[in-house]
């Protein structure tokens, strides 16, 4: 053997080296790679050093028996059956409350004849739940509402007012409370004639004691 070169580098099972016929002089770099479904164990890059030895031990190619970590999904939690995701492992994604799942909830790590194991599906997404709007309430008689839309998004507020000479009975502003379904925080108010209010408020009601009701009247009721 020549004494001015590094030793010959062999092929490795389930992998190859590049260049395939390297010069074995000082400074030469050789890279080992593995066939699909295998991964390099050890250093994949070897260099012929000044002392004519290789910088690292020869690597090997080991069968890949697990899937990569599919990752976290925003606005969710995940339940894992095996921490290193071997073939057969499952990962379940559950969206946080107020979010809906788009995609597969459960992923399973499957083996493949050729290539590395693969997840049954891609990780899902958790999207913000679309809350249903509230249906527009009609304006009270002799009054108005603002805004005058047919649908009001969850969280929106509508305001009521009365025509001159009328007063508002009830809440002047009501809110579309988010939910399933969304709903109004209060019933719509009514507009009453101001003069009638004054009339009733300034008078007390006298009640005359009625005679005892006869049984015929009772029967009629």
């Amino acid at each position: 053997p020549r004494n001015d070169t590094c030793p010959e580098l062999p092929e490795i099972p389930n992998g190859w080296k590049s260049p395939s016929q390297p010069e074995l002089v000082h400074g030469t770099v050789v890279t080992y790679q593995c066939y699909p479904g295998y991964q390099v164990v050890g250093s994949s890059v070897l260099m012929c050093q000044w002392d004519l030895t290789w910088s690292e031990d020869l690597p090997s190619c080991q069968r890949v028996t697990s899937c990569h970590d599919p990752g976290d999904v925003e606005h969710s939690r995940r339940l894992i059956s095996s921490p290193k995701f071997p073939v057969g492992a499952t990962v379940q994604y559950i969206c946080d409350q107020g979010f809906v799942l788009m995609g597969s909830s459960i992923l399973t790590c499957h083996d493949r004849q050729a290539g590395s194991p693969k997840w049954s599906d891609r990780a899902p997404k958790c999207l913000l739940e679309q809350l249903k709007p509230c249906h527009g309430l009609s304006a009270p008689e002799n009054g108005a509402r603002s805004p005058e839309k047919q649908l009001h998004p969850a969280g929106a507020t509508i305001h009521f007012s009365c025509a001159p000479g009328y007063v508002l009975k009830g809440q002047a502003s009501i809110k579309c409370v988010p939910g399933h379904p969304s709903h109004w925080s209060d019933p719509p108010p009514i507009c009453r004639a101001a003069s009638l209010d004054g009339f009733y408020n300034s008078r007390s009601l006298d009640v005359a004691k009625a005679p005892a009701a006869s049984s015929t009247l009772d029967a009629a009721h």
């Epitope: 939690r77 339940l79 894992i80 379940q92 946080d96 107020g98 939910g179």
Partner: antibody, heavy 120, light 106 residues
Framework: QVQLVQSGAEVKKPGASVKVSCKAS????????MHWVRQAPGQGLEWMGE????????GYNQKFKGRVTMTRDTSISTAYMELSRLRSDDTAVYYC?????????????WGQGTLVTVSS | EIVLTQSPATLSLSPGERATLSCSAS?????MHWYQQKPGQAPRLLIY???KLPSGIPARFSGSGSGTDFTLTISSLEPEDFAVYYC?????????FGQGTKLEIK
């Protein structure tokens, strides 16, 4: 009706492990995730994690990762929670709990609780 | 994680009075759940999804709120209502609970 029955009180030394069981009845055990919640004396409630009894998948509160292990035995409809490297501040009542439906977020059913005392 | 702050820490009222318990979240949440706990007992679900009552819970209990501010109301206190009340969210993992409001007899 749904019932969750837990194992009895335990006294442990610091550094030891404890394993609490929760036997479910009145529903199909594998249909609902089982959660574990603890409550230190005079304190509030703290979610520890959950297990899906069907696939055996677990999800833990980051605070307990590396110390808690949740398992189940579907043949006897029982869930287990093991907490290792116990410290005195792990003294608490440990509850198993179940939600109303598979995809709901409130704890509708609770075990009676298991008091774990950690003391040297 | 989302921090839930309950107020007041202690509420002293008499039977027949109206109780209003508050729960404030450090970030917006979509729903709030409420529990009642009596000494030596497990918590009991009282309100879920902000305003829904589980079967068997009396109608004097009601819940409301949205965003960061939620309220549990007991319209007319019964002797058996004196206990500790907790709010809980799961709009973000991990689910978290408030530190509790103790409702005591005045």
């Amino acid at each position: 009706q749904v019932q969750l029955v837990q194992s009895g009180a335990e006294v442990k030394k610091p550094g030891a492990s404890v394993k609490v069981s929760c036997k479910a009845s009145g529903y199909t055990f594998t249909d609902y995730n089982m959660h574990w919640v603890r409550q230190a004396p005079g304190q509030g409630l703290e979610w520890m994690g959950e297990i899906n009894p069907n696939i055996g998948g677990t999800g833990y509160n980051q605070k307990f990762k590396g110390r808690v292990t949740m398992t189940r035995d579907t043949s006897i409809s029982t869930a287990y929670m093991e907490l290792s490297r116990l410290r005195s501040d792990d003294t608490a009542v440990y509850y198993c709990a179940r939600t109303y439906s598979y995809y709901s977020y409130e704890f509708a059913y609770w075990g009676q609780g298991t008091l774990v005392t950690v003391s040297s | 994680e989302i921090v839930l702050t309950q107020s007041p820490a202690t509420l002293s009222l008499s039977p027949g009075e109206r109780a209003t318990l508050s729960c404030s979240a450090s970030s917006s949440v979509s729903y709030m759940h409420w529990y009642q706990q009596k000494p030596g007992q497990a918590p009991r679900l009282l309100i879920y999804d902000t305003s829904k009552l589980p079967s068997g819970i009396p109608a004097r209990f009601s819940g409301s709120g949205s965003g960061t501010d939620f309220t549990l109301t007991i319209s007319s206190l019964e002797p058996e209502d004196f206990a500790v009340y907790y709010c809980q969210q799961w709009s973000s993992t991990p689910p978290t609970f408030g530190q509790g409001t103790k409702l005591e007899i005045k």
